[in-house]
């Protein structure tokens, strides 16, 4: 009853003459353990006998004996772990057929059939390829051999066009109840060049002898493989030449479908054949050419061919790093003249004249100067000739006004109070002068640009400077105006004595002045309108009070004269010319008032008076006036006074006072 038995094994086992077979086998029986195991070769059931007949290869007897002559058959199983594996070593062609596994338990019997296929010669492995091979896409190549046996070592080797493949293959074996095989797997990135090539998987024995092989031809799908050819075979051509480029399709799988041409990455219109012809090339046709060919795999682009169209330098132009340029700055000139090959020599021109020693594309001036202004042009030269000199480029060099000078327009000499006109001149300027500055700044008139009018010029307007200005101001050296003027700051100065002047002193007065232009001067001294002297000093050997008064000095030069302020000369002296005066006369009637006044000439004035009588007796009066009231006859007599100031004393002569009797007194007598 088949439902009671479950036996697992590969079904068919393959081998070849002299090899061996290993039959992996497991079983399960529902009731009871396996008691008897017989291995038949091609068993046939005898209906009459109700038993299987055939060659017995193995029989598990109680003592486990194998029939004589069948030592090559081994039962490797055991009843404990339900293993029914067996091997035949060596195996022969006539072993082909069925192996019958007769299994008997206490209650059940079963015959399991296993096919054994033993070929005369080793059979070839089978190469398995993926359905599609495409260049550079990694695939696994499999070489499968439905054989594996522990007692017989084999090896699978891969070859490409008969040459062992360098890639490492992974070999695996299977000896399971499901399958028996030896497999080699090779990871492989096919290249377009592998297309059509033969891959072989060889079966080798333990000695390396080739037992069998399988071969396949690779069908590697790839984009077109291109090369580009140029005729004439030089990619450097001259303007006007003709050039043909041919796109060769060295390989394409599948066949190519479209062709196009590109220049510098841009498709060329209406160029869809494998040949591109350029007639009478121009410089614009210089570039990198390639062809693009497509098939079902995708597009492919050839290597680029750099077509250089050579031509003589084109008319040049000059590029200037800055214009206008400021004097002193760095300026770079660049000669731009397209040419192929690049120019090897340059000639530079400034205002049409060749600049010696400058033969490079760039011409640098580290510090630009005014005379560098002008038109710059250049000529470029290559192997095909000298290019045309372009119109040139203008360099404008800007700089502050140069050589700024001041001119006095007046007829000289200039006198104080004159109107002076100054002009500010310069030799050159770029840009033009647009304003002027003047020092010192004053409320002066500028009647026109660069002209300064100073009305009523001051004596002290000594130096004036001007600047001519554009973007910068340049100052002229200051001009000394040399203004002529009458002496200034004239004053009288007492030289001696150092202290106050006393009568009798030696006195010197100096006529000072602060400045005069011209310097040559004359002096005049004046007192009360009278001329006293013509020296710078006025000297008094012994001053007297009569010399006191208001003095002036005058200083004159060729321009004019200047007077000092009046200077008061004060002479100090002791009281002098004292006299006693009597307002009512020197005869007074008794009983009246007699007033005596002490008159004096003194500087400083008298501060103290004393009165004396005819006996030189001091009277008890200290004022300037002596009042006798009422006057008596006995007051008659001579009187004198004394005056004192801080310089000294002076006294008057005697004056006689006569007091006469009144009529009443006479009447009483």
């Amino acid at each position: 009853d088949s439902s009671k038995w479950n036996i697992e094994h590969p079904g068919t086992i393959y081998a070849w003459e002299g090899a061996c077979v290993w039959v992996p086998c497991t079983y399960r029986v529902l009731d009871g353990a396996l008691e008897t195991f017989i291995l038949f070769h091609n068993p046939e059931y005898n209906q009459n006998m109700s038993k299987f007949e055939g060659t017995r290869l193995y029989e598990s007897t109680k003592d486990g004996k194998v029939p004589s002559g069948q030592k090559r058959v081994q039962f490797l199983g055991n009843k404990i772990n339900n293993n029914c594996t067996l091997s035949i070593h060596p195996v022969h062609v006539n072993d082909s057929g069925q192996l019958g596994l007769r299994m008997v338990s206490k209650t059940e019997k079963w015959m399991e059939r296993i096919h054994l296929n033993v070929s005369e010669r080793p059979f070839p492995p089978r190469i398995q390829l993926p359905p599609k091979l495409q260049e550079s896409q990694e695939v696994t190549l499999t070489c499968l051999l439905n054989f594996s046996c522990y007692g017989y070592q084999i090896q699978l080797q891969w070859l490409l066009e008969g040459v062992p493949m360098r890639q490492a293959a992974v070999t695996s074996t299977s000896l399971s109840t499901k399958s028996v095989f030896t497999r080699s797997e090779l990871k492989f990135s096919p290249q377009w060049s592998h297309h059509g090539k033969i891959v072989t998987c060889e079966l080798h024995d333990v000695d390396g002898k080739v037992l069998s092989e399988d071969m396949v031809q690779l069908n590697v799908k790839h984009t077109p493989k291109l090369t580009i050819e140029v005729t004439p075979n030089e990619t450097i051509v001259r303007k006007g030449d003709s050039v043909t480029m041919t796109c060769k399709v060295n390989s394409s799988n599948p066949e190519y479908t479209t062709v196009s041409w590109l220049k510098d990455g841009i498709p060329l219109k209406e160029q869809n054949t494998l040949m591109l012809t350029l007639h009478e090339v121009t410089k614009s046709q210089t570039g990198r050419y390639c062809c693009r060919v497509s098939n079902d795999v995708g597009p492919a682009t050839s290597e680029k061919v750099f077509l250089q169209v050579q031509y003589a330098p084109e008319p040049s132009r000059v590029q200037i790093s800055q214009s206008p340029a400021v004097e002193g700055s760095e300026v770079n000139f660049l000669c731009i003249s397209p040419a192929n090959p690049l120019p090897t020599n340059y000639t530079w021109y400034h205002n049409g004249k060749e600049v010696q020693g400058r033969t490079e594309k760039q011409f640098q001036i580290q510090k630009i100067l005014p005379w560098h202004a002008g038109t710059y042009s250049c000529e470029a030269e290559n192997i095909l000739g000298i290019g045309e000199r372009g119109p040139g480029t203008e360099l404008d060099v800007q700089y502050p006004p140069k050589k700024v000078t001041m001119v006095i327009e007046n007829p000289t000499p200039i006198r104080e109070g004159d109107t002076v006109t100054l002009s500010c001149n310069y030799s050159s300027s770029n840009p033009i002068v647009n304003h002027y500055e003047w020092r010192p700044r004053g409320a002066w008139e500028e009647p026109s640009l660069g002209v300064l009018k100073i009305q009523n010029i001051g004596w002290n307007n000594t130096a004036v400077a001007c600047a001519a200005c554009n973007n910068w101001c340049s100052w002229a050296s200051p001009v000394t105006l040399n203004v002529l003027y009458a002496p200034r700051g004239v004053r009288v100065r007492k030289i001696k004595p150092l202290s106050e002047i006393h009568s009798g002193n030696s006195v010197s007065l100096q006529c000072d002045f602060s400045s005069s232009h011209p310097k040559e001067v004359q002096f005049f001294w004046e007192k009360n309108g009278s001329l006293l002297g013509k020296e710078s000093q006025l000297n008094f050997d012994s001053i007297s009070p009569e010399d006191a008064g208001s003095y002036s000095c005058w200083v004159n030069n060729s321009i004019g004269q200047t007077a000092s302020k009046a200077w008061t000369l004060e002479v100090l002296y002791a009281p002098r010319r004292l006299r006693v005066s009597m307002s009512q006369g020197n005869q007074v009637m008794e009983g009246k008032t007699a007033t005596l006044t002490c008159e004096s000439d003194a500087n400083p004035p008298v501060y103290s008076y004393a009165w004396f009588d005819w006996n030189n007796q001091s009277l008890p009066y200290s004022g300037r006036m002596l009042r006798l009231e009422p006057v008596k006859v006995q007051h008659s007599g001579a009187y004198w006074c004394q005056g004192t100031n801080r310089v000294g004393k002076g006294h008057s002569p005697l004056i006689t006072l006569t007091v006469y009797y009144s009529p009443q007194t006479i009447g009483r007598r």
């Epitope: 004097e327 010696q356 020693g357 005014p370 005379w371 560098h372």
Partner: antibody
Amino acid sequence: QVTLKESGPGILQSSQTLSLTCSFSGFSLSTSGMGVSWIRQPSGKGLEWLAHIYWDDDKRYNPSLKSRLTISKDTSRNQVFLKITSVDTADTATYYCARAPPPNWDEYYFDYWGQGTTLTVSS
Amino acid sequence: DIQMTQSPASLSASVGETVTITCRASGNIHNSLAWYQQKQGKSPQLLVHNAKTLADGVPSRFSGSGSGTQYSLKINSLQPEDFGSYYCQHFWSTPPFGGGTKLEIK
């Protein structure tokens, strides 16, 4: 005619500052393109350029000495000055000032030289 | 920066001989080269500027030539007063002066 004359201290101690004056006549340092350089020469050795001042007050220095040098001018007094800080015995040399006339293009050269002033630096 | 290399460093010659001193620049100096003569204890004196223009008062036996990076000073028929040191100079190089050539009497 053009003349240049250098003046300096003659002797300095190490670490002191050297002040040199170049007084010139016969040209103006306000003329476009005009310049004056200082150049020195240790005894028995070659010429070593130190610094240059242009009419527009642009200054150039020898890179290896730049941090120690200061060049200046007084255009109105026709003088150019050079200061060298922290002098050392290696600065012992004859110091020249020289005029570079306005060039045609960029070809500055020295057409007039002073007679030189000698500096001795003692340690 | 452009470097100036002067050669030879020293040279012995006899009166009447012709000598050549060369100066090589590390880049094109566009003829902006000057030559100086310096006698013992004296200031240098300009001989040639713009590579080939003789300075005022310089005898015609001196001549300058060259272009680009190679320049030379030639002295024909050496005179006793020609012995001394010679320097080339290009203003925009660092340093501007060549190392010098000492011309001595053989």
